[in-house]
């Protein structure tokens, strides 16, 4: 056969679907690889062909579209399973071709099992809700195109294993789940089960997502430097190790680039001829506020180093702050013998 533009195995389309549920999978060619859509391709006389390679096999084989009750079918650029079976797992290829043109891409499909509490190896999308922010909603994802708008499905929402009914601040509203005031206690996995009829059969779609309650933009503040501060003086003798921690609190801000850095005499530590190391650690609160600590370390400090200005800077999308550390040279205690001699007027 003639040369075919092979886009390889697109692992970005690592599709996971639940066993014994309908699945509709669009050919990724039109979404990510080609500059035209299926309708244009079809009008130009191109044919879309599907085939697959079973899990742990090397042999490509055609998809059987003659199964009872049309369990697997194709409609335009969509491959349908009504429903899936565990052994449908494998790599699927869609190929667009005519006598002069050919383009194809493969993608992995994994059919996964779930238990009665919806636990499974499925990778879950995360939806962030702002804490105490007023009414916020999540929507049952990826159910478009499974049934016509004339069909009215029933939707049941669960938190973990429990059906959501008579919850204090969580109200099911069809495809949406409303949180009146999101609290930390609302963190968890939420599942919608959509049930709809089709040709005398009943199908279920199960969709689970993780809700994470994060800090509200209403409460967001510029970075706060806890250390260095005015209460701590770093008093050292030459030859000792100087350790200055810079500890900064950042409010959670969606997509904010939080940064902490030290300057010495207004310059990057690298631009100064002293042997400085800086170690960073980052921790997060339950609402994803962030605390960054950067410890500036000079192994053997000199009297010159103790005269320098050490400033910690912090910046987020909310603003910028800076704080100088109080560094000074320790005054050596007077030697007792000298003091005594002076007291007696010795010369």
């Amino acid at each position: 056969s003639e040369r075919c533009d092979d886009w390889g195995l697109d692992t970005m389309r690592q599709i996971q679907v639940f066993e014994d549920e309908p699945a509709r999978i669009k050919c990724p060619l039109f979404e990510h690889f080609l500059k035209f859509n299926y309708s244009t391709a079809h009008s130009a006389g191109l044919t879309l062909i599907w085939y697959w390679t079973r899990q742990d096999r090397d042999l490509e084989e055609p998809i059987n579209f003659r199964l009872p009750e049309n369990r697997i079918s194709k409609e335009k650029d969509v491959l349908w399973f009504r429903p899936t079976l565990l052994n449908d797992t494998g790599n699927y290829t869609c190929m667009l071709r005519n006598t002069t043109y050919c383009s194809k891409v493969a993608f992995p499909l994994e059919v996964v099992q779930k238990d009665s509490c919806f636990n499974s190896p499925m990778k879950l999308p995360v939806h962030k809700l702002y804490i105490e922010y007023g009414i916020q909603r999540i929507t049952c994802p990826n159910v478009d195109g499974y049934f016509p708008s004339s069909v009215k499905p029933t939707i049941t929402w669960y938190m973990g294993c429990y059906k959501i009914q008579n919850f204090n601040n969580v109200i099911p509203e069809g495809m949406n789940l409303s949180f009146l005031i999101a609290l930390i206690s609302n963190n968890g996995n939420y599942t919608c089960v959509v049930t709809y009829p089709e040709n005398g059969r009943t199908f279920h779609l199960t969709r689970t997502l993780t809700v994470k309650v994060v800090g509200s933009p209403k409460n967001a503040v510029p970075p706060v430097i806890h250390s260095p501060n005015d209460h701590v003086v770093y008093e050292k003798e030459p030859g000792e190790e100087l350790l200055i921690p810079c500890t900064v609190y950042f409010s959670f801000l969606m997509d904010s680039r939080n940064e902490v850095w030290w300057t010495i005499d207004g310059k990057k530590p690298d631009d100064i001829t002293i042997d400085v190391t800086i170690n960073e650690s980052i921790s997060h609160s339950r609402t994803e506020d962030e605390t960054r600590t950067q410890i500036l370390s000079i192994k053997k400090v000199t009297s010159e180093d103790l005269k320098r200005s050490y400033v910690c800077h912090a910046r987020s999308a909310k603003g910028e702050v800076a704080k100088a550390a109080k560094v000074k040279q320790k005054v050596p205690a007077p030697r007792y013998t000298v003091e005594l001699a002076c007291g007696f007027g010795a010369t």
Partner: antibody, heavy 118, light 106 residues
Framework: EVQLVESGGGLVQPGGSLRLSCAAS????????MSWVRQAPGKGLVWVAE????????YYPDTVTGRFTISRDNAKNTLYLQMNSLRAEDTAVYYC???????????WGQGTTVTVSS | EIVLTQSPATLSLSPGERATLSCSAS?????MYWYQQKPGQAPRLLIY???NLASGIPARFSGSGSGTDFTLTISSLEPEDFAVYYC?????????FGQGTKLEIK
């Protein structure tokens, strides 16, 4: 003298993988956040990935999330970019660049060319 | 995502003239950064924190602006200044660049 030298570029088929390296010298590598920035032929600059000083935090744009992985070895003063499921639109010159605090991308490598084509 | 739009796309001027390049952000950013790129070379940092000159950059370059509107000015063009200029925001992920302004000799 600060130097960043990229390597590992080349021709790869769609769906294939490539690992880029960036060897750093002339500065305290572990004190700097590092990034990869790419430039498709005749196009502008596009940020691809960033890694924190210690390597524990990584950041990506949606276009490469799940396909590209940035990592670093501070003992070897080397930055890496593992690129999987490559597509034609990933064809570009890939630069590594360092950043410190409010000094973003003050030094860049000379770039390494990645071509994705069947 | 914060989108940066640079104008004009191309600016044709003569050496000695003043160049004004604009960068507009789709939402407010704290600071803007500017880079210069010549053909076949890596970009070079010109301006950081909106108005600070990077190390080794001549004083004819200056930056200004706040919020969503930022400007790079070259007071008197030298022959070596003809290149592509990019603005970049550093406030939010994903980090984004403008599409570039090509400064060419008239």
């Amino acid at each position: 003298e600060v130097q960043l030298v990229e390597s590992g570029g080349g021709l790869v088929q769609p769906g294939g993988s490539l690992r880029l390296s960036c060897a750093a010298s002339g500065f305290t590598f572990s004190s700097y956040a590092m990034s990869w920035v790419r430039q498709a032929p005749g196009k502008g600059l596009v940020w691809v990935a960033e890694i924190s000083r210690g390597g524990s935090h990584t950041y990506y744009p949606d276009t490469v999330t799940g396909r590209f992985t940035i990592s670093r070895d501070n003992a070897k003063n080397t930055l890496y970019l593992q690129m999987n499921s490559l597509r034609a639109e990933d064809t570009a010159v890939y630069y590594c660049a360092r950043s410190y605090g409010n000094y973003p991308f003050d030094y860049w490598g000379q770039g390494t060319t990645v071509t994705v084509s069947s | 995502e914060i989108v940066l739009t640079q104008s004009p796309a191309t600016l044709s001027l003569s050496p000695g003239e003043r160049a004004t390049l604009s960068c507009s952000a789709s939402s407010s950013v704290s600071y803007m950064y500017w880079y210069q790129q010549k053909p076949g070379q890596a970009p070079r940092l010109l301006i950081y924190d909106t108005s600070n000159l990077a190390s080794g950059i001549p004083a004819r370059f200056s930056g200004s602006g706040s919020g969503t509107d930022f400007t790079l000015t070259i007071s008197s063009l030298e022959p070596e200044d003809f290149a592509v200029y990019y603005c970049q925001q550093w406030s939010s992920y994903p980090l984004t660049f403008g599409q570039g302004t090509k400064l060419e000799i008239k």
